[in-house]
């Protein structure tokens, strides 16, 4: 079972439709439709697992279910990245990996899927409420971020049912682009329905596997955005919080982790390494997901075996050798 | 077949610049992530930095000992990848070779390096 | 930075020989480890990535083990063109580091 972070359905009109209105008309509504239902919103999926064996051992699994190439994934716990969360792992398709404790083990387990093992005891162990969270950064979708918790009274062993509140971010620049066009294409195909009134026009409906509906944020590497975005996430377990980095993680860590984006608040903030980097050709959204990935190594990595990395940046692709050559 | 050829070494005064080539065939260029490495005379390799594939921005990331004299680029319409050396010092003598990198994932996991090119070496003397 | 260290530096042996070599990461690494055979005025080859997996066109007799922090590379059977040093590789994290190298001379 798995905890996902449904996206609202875009439900089309009834049959009939085509009858109503002229087939020349609906040539170009249809194809739009088509477009704005299957080009879907990606969706984030988080299970949360205690193992049976060890009480105190934790397995999250993270799945992005989008077409685009991850170029960063964030592992945090204690509430959503940059509201209040912690890190726990940072996974880089080129760069590599870091993870701190209890983080023990992260992984890629595809290339759109990642599962990291938590352990340990005392301040820095999870205990069965506290809330984990995974935001994926991929282009062009954007950066999406969603919840789970393993409720108090489950079983050792069990899976978490499904979030009630996950938390979706889509980055600006994924929004842009793309999206935009797709975006002015649905509000044209709505804009055609409402003119003929043979039919009401495609409502934005819930998921009803989500008892309320997600919530989308835009963002943008600033304290200003943050701050007028901001999202609480109202689950979080405060007594399960892991002890605060200033005394947790003491400073250092290589150059590339140096600078972070601010909507990581919460953070200590290094030194500006990655202030000489040019914003890449394909916008500043590579950008801010590195400085996400460069934050969290203001602190050194804990000792534990980490990751899977993608055999190809263009995007999901089977490999059984490097590059493909096996 | 996949190939890389260096060139652009050969003796320069310490505090000059050079600038190395790796001309890339046989693959996709702007769809992995390109390294330079060294090894200077009876040692052993290091990494000297990367530039990220097309698809992450063609971010740069160095070593240490080079940051900020070391620029690496790449130029896709040519295949191309650069090594420009600034403030060179008479440490930073050595063969320098570029590789292409790959991921694998799964059970199977690293970061890992192939092939490389042969080499071109840079004499930092006075 | 993760260090990593090779042994034995340097070792002496004979066509057909068993060979085996050693590299120990200063953190857990998982499975993430390279190796690489140089042959002297020559680039590096790579022979095994993550861990235990064999680079294709690469001869079966070459082999690798580990996890964590502890590796190794088999040449079940040295052959005369094995003789060249080989190299370790992280590949957890930059930067990317190796092993000091060792090299393999015929006795």
């Known amino acids: 079972m798995r905890t996902e972070a449904q996206v609202p359905a875009l439900q089309p009109p009834e049959p009939g439709l085509e009858g109503a209105m002229g087939h020349r008309t609906l040539v170009l509504p249809w194809v739009l439709l088509t477009l704005c239902v299957t080009a879907g919103t990606p969706e984030v999926w988080v299970q949360v697992r205690m193992e049976a064996t060890e009480l105190s051992s934790f397995t999250i699994r993270c799945g992005f279910l989008g077409s685009g190439s991850i170029s960063l994934v964030t592992v945090s716990w204690g509430g959503p990245n940059g509201a209040g969360g912690t890190t726990l792992a940072v996974l880089h398709p080129e760069r590599g990996i870091r993870q701190w404790a209890p983080a023990r083990q992260a992984r890629w387990e595809t290339q759109s899927s990642i599962s990291l093992i938590l352990e340990g005891s005392g301040a820095s162990s999870p205990c069965a409420n506290t809330t984990f969270c995974c935001k994926f950064a991929s282009f062009p979708e954007g950066s999406w971020e969603a919840c789970g918790s393993l409720p108090p009274s489950s079983d050792p062993g069990l899976s978490a049912p499904p979030t009630p509140a996950p938390i979706l971010r889509a980055d600006l620049a994924g929004i842009l682009g793309v999206s935009g066009v797709l975006l002015f294409g649905c509000v044209y195909l709505l804009h055609l329905l409402r003119r003929h009134k043979h039919r009401p026009a495609p409502r934005l409906q819930p998921s009803r596997t989500s008892p309320q509906a997600p919530r989308a944020r835009a963002w943008a590497p600033s304290q200003a955005s943050q701050a007028a975005l901001h999202v609480p996430y109202a689950t979080i377990n405060t007594s399960c919080r892991p002890a605060t980095l200033d005394t947790a993680h003491p400073h250092g860590g290589p150059s590339w982790w140096a600078s972070l984006p601010t909507h990581a608040a919460h953070r200590p903030q290094g030194p500006a390494a990655w202030a000489s980097t040019p914003i890449p050709a394909r916008g500043s959204f590579v950008s801010v997901e590195n400085g996400l990935y460069a934050q969290a190594g203001e602190r050194p990595p804990h000792t534990g075996p980490g990751l899977t990395l993608f055999p190809d940046p263009r995007g999901p692709r089977a490999m059984e050798g490097p590059l493909g050559v096996r | 077949e996949v190939q890389l050829v260096e060139s652009g070494g050969g003796l320069v005064q310490p505090g000059r610049s050079l600038r190395l080539s790796c001309t890339a065939s046989?693959?996709?260029?702007?769809?992995?992530?390109m390294s330079w490495f060294r090894q200077a005379p009876g040692k052993g390799l290091e990494w000297v930095g990367y530039i990220g594939s097309k698809a992450y921005g063609g971010e740069t990331e160095y070593t240490a000992s080079v940051k900020g004299r070391f620029t690496i680029s790449r130029d896709g319409s040519k295949s191309i990848a650069y090594l420009q050396m600034n403030s060179l010092k008479t440490e930073d003598t050595a063969v320098y070779y570029c590789a292409r990198a790959g991921h694998s994932y799964g059970s199977i996991a690293s970061n890992w390096f192939d092939p490389w090119g042969q080499g071109t070496l840079v004499t930092v003397s006075s | 930075d993760i260090q990593m260290t090779q042994s034995p530096s340097s070792l002496s042996a004979s066509v057909g020989d068993r060979v085996t070599i050693t590299c120990r990461a200063s953190?857990?690494?998982?499975?993430?480890l390279n190796w690489y055979q140089q042959k002297p005025g020559k680039a590096p080859k790579l022979l095994i990535y993550?861990?235990?997996s064999l680079q294709s066109g690469v001869p079966s007799r070459f082999s690798g083990s580990g996890s964590g922090t502890d590796f190794t590379l088999t040449i079940s059977s040295l052959q005369p063109e094995d003789f060249a040093t080989y190299y370790c590789q992280q590949g957890f994290y930059t930067p990317w580091t190796f092993g000091g190298g060792t090299k393999v001379e015929i006795k």
């Open positions: 046989g693959f996709t260029f702007g769809d992995v992530a």
């Open positions: 953190q857990s690494i998982s499975s993430y």
């Open positions: 993550g861990a235990s």
